[in-house]
Interface confidence: low
């Protein structure tokens, strides 16, 4: 028996359902009574779901997994993982045994988009050219850790005097806070880009500092 999975990671958004695809080629006359199917975590060998002795043995993993029972006889051994969490990320191995056995691993990459950044300024009044200001860009509830980029109004990257911190909450999602310290020019626009490297998603925020009231 030959097991096939995608070698490209399955990307799943937090709180959505993901399908880890696994298939095999059944011989003519194959029946489910012959099938032993086991899904387990690749590294720890923890059992996730199994089908043995002609029946679905159910989820052994937080009751959030399911097979596709009507498709098993056609060789579809895929696993459905419901309400994906950050802690589900990792490699899963699909073992199929009929007479001989084969197995293959599929990786699950969990992702969550970052919110539109909010921009704050300190100090936020009586600003003059030459003043040192601190601009904070905050974006929330993303995964995995973000890449943060600052640019000025001409699109020139600002790399000096940037401090970025990322903190995970109880769900494993990251809040990112990036602080730019900059000396004000006569007028200036400062933009922050928060990129999710897995989703290739960019979230933008900017602040324009003029002689007039600030615009965000």
């Amino acid at each position: 028996v030959e097991v096939q999975v995608s070698e490209d990671p399955v990307v799943a958004l937090v709180d959505t359902d993901a399908t880890l695809r696994c298939s095999f080629s059944p011989e003519p006359g194959f029946s489910l009574a012959q099938l032993n199917l086991i899904w387990q975590l690749t590294d720890t060998k923890q059992l996730v779901h199994s089908f043995t002795e002609g029946r679905d043995q159910g989820s052994a993993y937080s009751n959030r997994t399911a097979l596709f029972p009507d498709l098993l006889v056609q060789g579809n051994a895929s696993l459905r993982l419901q309400r994906v969490r950050v802690t589900d990320e990792g490699s899963y191995t699909c073992f199929v045994s009929i007479q001989d056995f084969d197995s293959a691993a599929v990786s699950l990459q969990v992702a969550a988009p970052y919110s539109k950044p909010s921009m704050t300024l300190e100090p936020n009044k009586d600003l003059r050219p030459g003043n040192m200001v601190t601009i904070t860009c905050s974006s929330y509830q993303g995964y995995p850790e973000a890449e943060v980029f600052w640019k000025d109004g001409q699109g020139v990257p600002l790399t000096g005097n940037v401090t970025t911190s990322q903190m995970a909450n109880e769900r494993g999602l990251f809040d990112v806070h990036s602080v730019l310290r900059v000396v004000l020019g006569a007028n200036g626009t400062y933009s922050c880009l928060v990129r999710n490297p897995v989703l290739q998603q960019d979230a933008h925020g900017s602040v324009t500092i003029t002689g007039q009231p600030l615009t965000f």
Partner: antibody
């Protein structure tokens, strides 16, 4: 840390045989397909062969079909390439690589020289 | 003659953006995802881009990949001297039942 270490290369006469080995560590070897890729001196990459995780299916480039045999021993975390009827054009650095369709880790390679 | 066609060479100066193309057919690029590999002088190849446009962790975001129809391309922005290397595209060919590489592109960083 994933590591792939090839061995078994050397100088062999045309028509001779060699067996290359690739010792794998740092990942669950038995769950991944594996491949051999070669590079002749000063030339580009050429895929040689690939094998499924359980060893049930094997694929070969036309240039080596019938002469080379890929195999694996999952109990030893080792991939093999048996090369028979070697020709001068088989001279190359042979790399083993993790996966069959997307080579995410490579060994440092072992040099095979076929010359009389 | 490689199944996938790449320009043999490309060049740029530090800070520039360089694009490397990879042209195939419906049986390879047209039906399977493309992977890009970087081979620095005297070293083994390294995975650079997978699934047409995804970067493994550790690969700078200056590297990006894209695919349209039966062609793929690798773009390198903000070119650096350490990017001087050979770049290969690769994918599975369903007709040949084999993995195929492009002939490779030697990238030179000038100046």
């Amino acid at each position: 840390e994933v590591q792939l270490l090839e061995s078994g290369g050397g100088l062999v006469q045309p028509g001779g045989s060699l067996r290359l080995s690739c010792a794998a560590s740092g990942f669950t070897f038995s769950s991944y397909g594996m491949s051999w890729v070669r590079q002749a001196p000063g030339k580009g990459l050429e895929w040689v062969s690939g094998i499924y995780s359980g060893g049930s299916s094997k694929y070969y480039a036309d240039s080596v079909k019938g002469r080379f045999t890929i195999s694996r021993d999952n109990s030893k975390n080792t991939l093999y390439l048996q090369m028979n009827s070697l020709r001068a054009e088989d001279t190359a650095v042979y790399y083993c690589a993790k996966n069959r369709l997307r080579f995410d880790y490579w060994g440092q390679g072992t040099l095979v020289t076929v010359s009389s | 003659q490689s199944v996938l066609t790449q320009p043999p060479s490309a060049s740029g100066t530090p800070g520039q953006r360089v694009t490397i193309s990879c042209t195939g057919s419906s049986s390879n690029i047209g039906s399977n995802s493309v992977t890009w590999y970087q081979q620095l002088p005297g070293t083994a190849p390294k995975l650079l881009i997978y699934s047409d446009s995804h970067r493994p962790s550790g690969v700078p975001d200056r590297f990006s990949g894209s695919k349209s129809g039966t062609s793929a391309s690798l773009a390198i922005s903000g070119l650096r001297s350490e990017d001087e290397a050979d770049y290969y595209c690769g994918t599975w060919d369903a007709s040949l039942n084999a993995y195929v590489f492009g002939g490779g592109t030697k990238l030179t960083v000038l100046g």
